[in-house]
């Protein structure tokens, strides 16, 4: 029951996280730009991974896409790639985890298969979350190191006016959405990996032996069941009885882990 709950919760947390990563990737508010000494009028700029927007004090808002690839910083391209990889891995992970859910029956899928799928999706969620966190962190670092407080001296033409302008870049809402979403996806992935351990069937250290006595002359050799501890002289499941006792491998019968002879 605890395993099902852990798996289900992991799935839901990862689902919310991946939805958040998609939202953050599509959002325009990755960074905002303010002019300290704006000499013209009240205009607010904000930028995303795909386009730049302007919002005026009147409420008018307009966005323009980055139509050039060559003019964009390599860091921005890297952030785009990380976020997309995170989304793709997360989406595949969700797909795999749906089939891995213990509460969903698909044909005669064994617990071991579900355990493997749960582990796979868990790892995918972990990598997806890490990609998102890395992408957002790289962008934040880019803002801090390259743009944070850029004081620029502008010259226009020969003998033109010089204007010192301070442009302040601040973290946009998308960065915080990305960090939280990446964290949730990561937590969901860890929960799936934990659930995988509970789903995996416990492997016994011995193979049950079935006895088929062929006559009254069967010689009983003491210590024949020492293998049950996993440490005796018979850990390799050798034939102990000549009178028809065979290991299960030889008999070709495959009982479940709950069938004991």
């Amino acid at each position: 029951m605890a395993v099902t709950a852990c798996q289900g919760l992991g799935f839901v947390v990862s689902l919310i996280g991946i939805a958040g990563i998609i939202a953050a990737t599509c959002m325009d508010q990755w960074s905002t730009q303010d002019l300290y000494n704006n000499p013209v009028t009240a205009v607010f700029n904000y930028q995303g991974l795909w386009r730049s927007c302007v919002r005026e004090s009147s409420g008018f808002t307009e966005c323009r896409g980055y139509f050039t690839l060559l003019g964009l910083p390599a860091m921005l391209q890297a952030v785009r790639a990380l976020m997309i990889v995170g989304i793709v891995l997360g989406a595949i992970g969700l797909l795999v985890s749906i089939f891995a859910l213990k509460c969903i029956r698909i044909g005669s899928m064994e617990d071991s298969a579900k355990a493997n799928m749960t582990l796979t999706s868990g790892i995918m969620f972990i990598v997806s979350g890490l990609c998102a966190i890395a992408g957002v962190s790289v962008f934040a670092n880019m803002l801090v190191t390259n743009f944070w407080m850029s004081t620029a001296n502008m010259y226009t033409g020969m003998g033109g006016m010089v204007q010192t302008v301070q442009t302040r870049y601040t973290f946009g809402a998308a960065l915080f959405v990305g960090w939280v979403a990446g964290g949730l996806t990561l937590i969901g992935g860890v929960m799936m990996c934990i659930a995988c351990r509970g789903l995996a069937p416990e492997e016994t250290n011995y193979k049950a032996v079935s006895y088929h006595a062929s006559g009254h002359s069967v010689a009983y050799k003491p210590g024949g069941f020492k293998a049950s501890t996993g440490f005796g002289s018979n850990t390799k499941n050798k034939k102990i009885y000549d009178g028809g006792a065979r290991t299960e491998d030889e008999v070709q019968s495959y009982p479940s882990k709950h069938d004991y002879v």
Partner: nanobody, 122 residues
Amino acid sequence: QVQLVESGGGLVQPGGSLRLSCAASGSIFSINAMGWYRQAPGKQRELVAAITFGGGSTNYADSVKGRFTISRDNSKNTLYLQMNSLRAEDTAVYYCNADLLVGGFPRRNVYWGQGTLVTVSS
């Protein structure tokens, strides 16, 4: 590199009209707003009029309201100032100012033109 080139200044009689223009060129991603400032001899530079390029919101100095009209042509990245009923106190160097986003992943900067002289005298 971004350039702002003003034109249209000159000598005009009181009550006359002039039309100033300012063309922005270079690696401009988009224009937030543009405006006209003026600086009379021995005085501080002051805002005359400003306009946002997206919504077209305008802002005028009290001294020019009803006489001056600011406009823009988005397709040409050009700013205009129509000056009517000019007075002697309007004599000054008129500077074009632009709040721009520049570059591929745009940075916001403010640029100034070199200025054009407007003289109102009889």
